[in-house]
């Protein structure tokens, strides 16, 4: 399998609303027209797929309607946003990029972005 370098930030802190954004950048060895991006979560040595999108170069990423991910693409960069995160979702989020067409097929897997999610403190009861 032809390998491709994928870069992503080491650490990202989710917002108080449970939203985390990071850039996934790949070093495209060829002129891909169709690219698949998959976000994987690794926690306790288990890897699960968070979301995936296939896009045509120059077009927007389209995730499934019920996906917790959204994203935009610009050249060889994909800006990914994951929403609805809670403290229990803290973990390593790995960006996997596949150049689907034209051949040859290339696969690149990033080292992962550690996303920290802190649940907001509930507002204290007020007498006012």
């Amino acid at each position: 399998c032809k390998a491709m370098h994928v870069a992503q930030p080491a650490v990202v802190l989710a917002s108080s609303r449970g939203i985390a954004s990071f850039v996934c950048e790949y070093a495209s060895p060829g002129k891909a027209t169709e690219v698949r991006v998959t976000v994987l979560r690794q926690a306790d040595s288990q890897v699960t797929e968070v979301c995936a999108a296939t896009y045509m170069m120059g077009n927007e990423l389209t995730f499934l309607d019920d996906s917790i991910c959204t994203g935009t693409s610009s050249g060889n960069q994909v800006n990914l946003t994951i929403q609805g995160l809670r403290a229990m979702d803290t973990g390593l989020y790995i960006c996997k990029v596949e150049l689907m067409y034209p051949p040859p097929y290339y696969l690149g897997i990033g080292n992962g972005t550690q996303i920290y999610v802190i649940d907001p403190e509930p507002c204290p009861d007020s007498d006012f």
Epitope: C1, K2, K31, T33, E34, T54, M56, E98, M100, Y101, P102, P103, P104, Y105, L107
Partner: antibody
Framework: QVQLVQSGAEVKKPGASVKVSCKAS????????MHWVRQAPGQRLEWMGW????????NYAQNFQGGVTMTRDTSINTVYMELSSLKSDDTAVYYC????????????????WGQGTMVTVSS | AIQLTQSPSSVSASVGDRVTITCRAS??????LAWYQQKPGKAPKLLIY???SLQSGVPSRFSGSGSGTDFTLTISSLQPEDFATYYC?????????FGQGTKVEIK
């Protein structure tokens, strides 16, 4: 010359699996994706997916995900398409087709096709 | 997913006639369209790729045109061996869908 030769016709019972082979010759086997296309009696052609002979990577149409497995054996220049949990509406001719990509036109197509394998699913 | 609609579904024509088949995509696909010919009991044969590029070995009486959503396959002078079913296929994005086919019959 460049050709794709497929395995013979199959008759299967509902719920069974079938594995169709496609042997390539006359070109660099690992330089082209191999696609699978099916055609039910009197119906349009339906793209099922591709396998990359070089890496073994696959890309399946959503309709077939979970039911189809495409593999390859580079030692004998052969790709395989296995369809599981067969139903009567899987009765069709299954074709393998070589991917053709024109770098100047930046467009793909299927330039070489196998002769087709008829799969009949009947109880 | 992108869908393709061909028209007409069938056409009756005589040898020497000019035949035109159209293919409409449900969304823009640039020039990423191919045309195939299929005869009964046989595998399809590639005629045109990239909307208008003639595949090697295909007679020049076949031509393709169009871009975006509307495409045309033209047979300038129908020959006896051209009676068959013709399919368009979008190769813009997966899944690579085919049209429903146009059958060219002898009048």
């Amino acid at each position: 010359q460049v050709q794709l030769v497929q395995s013979g016709a199959e008759v299967k019972k509902p719920g069974a699996s079938v594995k169709v082979s496609c042997k390539a010759s006359g070109y660099a086997f690992d330089g082209h994706y191999m696609h699978w296309v099916r055609q039910a009696p009197g119906q349009r052609l339906e793209w099922m997916g591709w396998v990359d002979p070089h890496s073994g990577a696959t890309n399946y149409a959503q309709n077939f995900q979970g039911g189809v497995t495409m593999t390859r054996d580079t030692s004998i220049n052969t790709v395989y398409m296995e369809l599981s949990s067969l139903k009567s509406d899987d009765t069709a001719v299954y074709y393998c087709a070589r991917d053709f990509y024109d770098t100047s036109a930046k467009s793909g197509a299927f330039d070489i096709w196998g002769q087709g394998t008829m799969v009949t699913v009947s109880s | 997913a992108i869908q393709l609609t061909q028209s007409p579904s069938s056409v009756s024509a005589s040898v020497g006639d000019r035949v035109t088949i159209t293919c409409r995509a449900s969304q823009g696909i640039s020039s990423w369209l191919a045309w195939y010919q299929q005869k009964p009991g046989k595998a399809p044969k590639l005629l045109i790729y990239a909307a208008s590029s003639l595949q090697s070995g295909v007679p020049s009486r076949f031509s393709g045109s169009g871009s975006g959503t509307d495409f045309t396959l033209t047979i300038s002078s129908l020959q006896p061996e051209d009676f068959a079913t013709y399919y368009c296929q979008q190769v813009n994005s997966f899944p690579w869908a085919f049209g429903q086919g146009t059958k060219v019959e002898i009048k």
